[in-house]
């Protein structure tokens, strides 16, 4: 499966795009992401890339202070209660409890910038990807992954952290975005929707996919996550869309079959090591790339996002298992754990392939409005 590049392939057509959204990215959701009253709770405090491993995951990841950009895992927010929208707003509810954790949820108050000022930044994630506007950069070479095929032992920790399901990855998984752009994988987690409602974070031409996987990496230039937060290229996330297909995905089944064991928030289990690369698309050469942020507080910027053009197929049953098995705080389902798309504010999304070239008979003239700026550096 490839991402929709032709109009007929894009279920939602062009859609409204973040670039045209004049609103502040976290003060108000963009028009396309405005919550509708009839939509169900999106109870997640969104996970992921920002839910970086704690000291028990990677001993070297130890924050040195309490100042902004130097966060401990326990400073990262956890979801408190379900919100209302299908496409959750960029708002949060903050509360103080015994361990001084930040509690927030989509659709709540106060707005995220009060939880973390970085959430008011101009270069936030996720975004809507418009292939026709992407800049083709031939310098963007195929991604290189090394050590992602893990043996069954040692086992890995799979955890319901209240806002996603997260698999902590062991040392040794190396990823290169290009020459001199080397990273180590830390963890992976998923974003999903609910019954009949898609839940990817990124969108393509306004189309939201059923789910999305994020594999979070730390640059080898940094020894600790807190040092990398907010630094350009300090963190990198590989993202892929999950779609419904006719067959069961055996790689994902190794994780999905264990979700029942971690149905409750805060619960975890050990799963045999697996081929992590099998959770990603097979085509490492075609992707979109841009600089953005973590998608929940602290919303640190400087994150390099690589979104695969190829999607991953899961069966309908597997997607239902993903969205229907886990529970968040209280008695709310862990669902709709995605942030609204954010405005590009002048950013140009780069493509490793000529994504703007439409092979459809209806569009004989390729449209390529942006040129490659970074040349892959």
């Amino acid at each position: 499966q490839r991402l929709p590049r032709m109009q007929e392939d894009s279920p939602l057509g062009g859609g409204s795009s973040g670039e045209d959204d004049p609103l502040g990215e976290e003060d108000l959701p963009s028009e396309e992401d405005s919550p509708r009253e009839e939509d169900p709770p999106g109870e997640e405090d969104l996970p992921g890339e920002e839910d970086l491993p704690g000291e028990e995951d990677l001993p070297e990841v130890k924050p040195k202070s309490e100042e902004e950009g130097s966060l401990k895992l326990e400073d990262l927010p956890t979801v408190e209660a379900p919100g209302d929208p299908q496409e959750p707003q960029n708002n949060a509810h903050r509360d103080k409890e015994g361990d001084d954790q930040s509690h927030w949820r989509y659709g709540g108050d106060p707005p995220w910038p009060r939880v973390s000022p970085a959430c008011a930044g101009r270069f936030q994630s996720p975004v809507d990807i418009r292939p026709q506007l992407a800049a083709f950069c031939p310098a963007l070479r195929p991604l290189e992954l090394l050590g992602f095929q893990l043996p069954p032992l040692p086992e890995l920790r799979l955890r319901n952290n209240g806002h996603s399901v997260q698999l902590t990855l062991p040392p040794g998984l190396e990823m290169a975005l290009g020459p001199g752009r080397e990273y180590r994988a830390l963890q992976l987690h998923l974003h999903w929707g609910a019954a009949g409602r898609p839940g990817s974070e990124h969108t393509v031409e306004g189309h939201r996919f059923p789910a999305e996987i994020h594999v979070v990496h730390l640059s080898t230039a940094f020894a600790r996550v807190d040092e990398a937060l907010g630094r350009p290229g300090g963190l990198a996330v590989l993202a892929a869309f999950l779609e419904e297909g006719p067959e069961e995905n055996s790689a994902y089944e190794q994780l999905l079959s264990r979700l029942e064991e971690i149905a409750e928030e805060g619960s975890e289990t050990q799963v045999p090591g697996l081929d992590i690369s099998a959770l990603l698309p097979s085509d490492f050469s075609r992707y979109f790339q841009y600089e953005g942020s973590l998608t929940t507080p602290p919303c640190a910027q400087g994150v390099i996002w690589t979104v695969f053009n190829q999607t991953v197929m899961l069966s309908a049953k597997q997607l239902h298992t993903l969205s229907d098995t886990l529970w968040g705080p209280g008695d709310s389902r862990l669902q709709l754990n995605f942030r609204a798309t954010q405005p590009l504010n002048g950013r140009v999304i780069e493509a490793s392939f000529p994504a703007g070239v439409d092979s459809s008979p209806r569009a004989a003239e390729p449209v390529q409005l942006n040129s490659c700026l970074a040349a892959g550096d």
């Epitope: 939509d39 019954a195 149905a263 409750e264 529970w327 008695d331």
Partner: antibody, heavy 121, light 107 residues
Framework: QVELVESGGGLVQPGGSLRLSCAAS????????MSWVRQAPGKGLEWVSG????????YYADSVKGRFTISRDNSKNTLYLQMNSLRAEDTAVYYC??????????????WGQGTLVTVSS | DIQMTQSPSSLSASVGDRVTITCRAS??????LSWYQQKPGKAPKLLIY???NLQSGVPSRFSGSGSGTDFTLTISSLQPEDFAVYYC?????????FGQGTKVEIK
């Protein structure tokens, strides 16, 4: 075809105990969550307890928490409900139901015929 | 807990009539709603799940609709075997809860 057969009901005095069983056949028992739902005479349906497919998570209605225990033996394809400290308000027909997924809180796609529990002195 | 309110609590209808039963949730439950039919002395039988999906083996005269808080079960042409009590159930929140039931009687 899917079949669920409850047993173990009967007359018991307040404060007494009973153990209900639900024998399952016609499907892969270990792949489905299971629940107990009860119906007092002339009343509606009330969910009592649920257990996930592998038995790793169990849930109870507030009205029975601490008194009832749900369990399952996947090798025997059997669901159980141990009921202690029974009260008059526990009098009902108890149904076991298969949920539509490995989890617990889903629709019940197949139900047993029920077993009557009467708590009276 | 999420409260489920069915209306009407009972209705009288004739064979061939179109019958509509509504169920309202006290909060948004997306489409996590099912409908059951129960005849005297029998176990409930699943008719509809996911608000609108017809359970295998259930006649197509039964249909469900709705999302969020308001749901409807429709019997397009009532048959003699359809006289029974109908229950809705939400399974979005915990614990799962049922409506109080709607009794469909012969007019």
């Amino acid at each position: 075809q899917v079949e669920l057969v409850e047993s173990g009901g009967g007359l018991v005095q307040p404060g007494g105990s009973l153990r209900l069983s639900c024998a399952a056949s016609g499907f892969t028992f270990s792949s489905y969550g299971m629940s107990w739902v009860r119906q007092a005479p002339g009343k509606g349906l009330e969910w009592v307890s649920g257990i996930s497919s592998l038995g790793s998570t169990t849930y109870y209605a507030d009205s029975v928490k601490g008194r009832f225990t749900i369990s399952r033996d996947n090798s025997k394809n059997t669901l159980y409900l141990q009921m202690n400290s029974l009260r008059a308000e526990d009098t009902a027909v108890y149904y076991c139901a298969r949920t539509g997924s490995p989890g617990t809180f889903m629709h019940g796609d197949h139900w047993g015929q029920g077993t009557l529990v009467t708590v009276s002195s | 807990d999420i409260q489920m309110t069915q209306s009407p609590s009972s209705l009288s209808a004739s064979v061939g009539d179109r019958v509509t039963i509504t169920c309202r949730a006290s909060q948004d439950i997306n489409n996590y709603l099912s409908w059951y039919q129960q005849k005297p002395g029998k176990a409930p039988k699943l008719l509809i799940y996911g608000a609108s999906n017809l359970q295998s083996g259930v006649p197509s005269r039964f249909s469900g609709s709705g999302s969020g808080t308001d749901f409807t079960l429709t019997i397009s042409s009532l048959q003699p075997e359809d006289f029974a009590v109908y229950y809705c159930q939400q399974y979005y929140g915990r614990p799962t809860t049922f409506g109080q039931g709607t009794k469909v009687e012969i007019k």
